[in-house]
């Protein structure tokens, strides 16, 4: 897998090219992660029939995956830059435990899964430089994460396949919403 954009602070720019602005770097980083998710979804869909399952059937899960809501200020109606930025960062931090779960779920795309995980960390770093209200964001509790990982890894094969599919689908949707919102900032 290629090195995630921004992973090396000494990014080599092409000659005569303007260095990327902070917003452009964030945009590029999200698109890089979305490409990674597409590759992972391809492997998941080839391996199981989860991708054919209806949204309704898949909705019957007890995963507490981050989701954008009206109150988060990320939609065009009621858009609020600071509230939205806090939601994006908080959501990405909450997704981290699920991305960690994905690390052992892929055979041929193992490197891609790692790249998605590490690139998400880089994205959070870019965004934390942009946020003014850092006190509104809390690092998720490691003890809670440890028990969630244990619980997810103890599921039967079918549930693990479904969990993998749901994480990828939800993370893709969350990033797409984030990308649209960040382009308004």
């Amino acid at each position: 897998a290629p090195v995630p954009p921004g992973e090396d602070s000494k990014d080599v720019a092409a000659p005569h090219r303007q260095p990327l602005t902070s917003s452009e770097r964030i945009d590029k980083q999200i698109r890089y992660i979305l490409d990674g998710i597409s590759a992972l979804r391809k492997e998941t869909c080839n391996k199981s029939n989860m991708c054919e399952s209806s949204k309704e059937a898949l909705a019957e899960n007890n995963l507490n995956l981050p989701k954008m809501a009206e109150k988060d200020g990320c939609f065009q109606s009621g858009f609020n830059e600071e509230t939205c930025l806090v939601k994006i960062i908080t959501g990405l931090l909450e997704f981290e435990v699920y991305l960690e779960y994905l690390q052992n779920r892929f055979e041929s795309s193992e490197e891609q899964a790692r790249a998605v995980q590490m690139s998400t960390k880089v994205l959070i770093q870019f965004l934390q430089k942009k946020a003014k209200n850092l006190d509104a964001i809390t690092t998720p509790d490691p003890t809670t994460n440890a028990s969630l990982l244990t619980k997810l890894q103890a599921q039967n094969q079918w549930l693990q396949d479904m969990t993998t599919h749901l994480i990828l689908r939800s993370f893709k949707e969350f990033l797409q919403s984030s990308l649209r919102a960040l382009r308004q900032m």
Epitope: E7, I89, L93, E96, V97, E100, Q117, M118, K121, V122, I124, Q125, Q128, L134, D135, I137, T138, T139, P140, D141, P142, T143, N145, A146, L149
Partner: nanobody, 125 residues
Framework: EVQLVESGGGLVQTGGSLRLSCATS????????MGWFRQAPGKEREFVAA??????????YYVDSVKGRFTISRDNAKNTVYLQMNSLKPEDSAVYYC????????????????WGQGTQVTVSS
């Protein structure tokens, strides 16, 4: 190649202070959570403190027995993590290890990827 090198250990009297340092190389330091662990003779390695890679509230975590006495901090520019230990007690005597993880369960020793060789801390009464 990833390297973690601890320093700053030594012999100190009860109530004294020490500052441990852990210099890292070959690691994307700024996106790794850094932790300190300790192991006394005949005992299991135990979690002491960790500094998450973000700057948000709750980004440091301590075992109850060291809360209020030990402070973990990190310097991303120097790729170094520190453990300031005050009001030391004889039961703090152990080999102290620095470790790095990308796990979200960053108070679990088994989820750390890289480890240093350790530095001895002895607190005499």
């Amino acid at each position: 190649e990833v390297q973690l090198v601890e320093s700053g250990g030594g012999l100190v009297q009860t109530g004294g202070s020490l500052r441990l340092s852990c210099a890292t190389s070959g690691l994307a330091f700024s996106i790794y959570t850094m932790g300190w662990f300790r192991q006394a003779p005949g005992k299991e390695r135990e979690f002491v403190a960790a500094a998450h890679w973000t700057v948000f509230r709750g980004n440091t975590y301590y075992v109850d027995s060291v809360k209020g006495r030990f402070t973990i901090s990190r310097d991303n520019a120097k790729n170094t993590v520190y453990l300031q230990m005050n009001s030391l007690k004889p039961e703090d005597s152990a080999v102290y290890y620095c470790a790095a993880t990308r796990s979200t369960a960053w108070n679990s020793p088994q989820r750390y990827d890289y480890w240093g060789q350790g530095t001895q801390v002895t607190v005499s009464s």
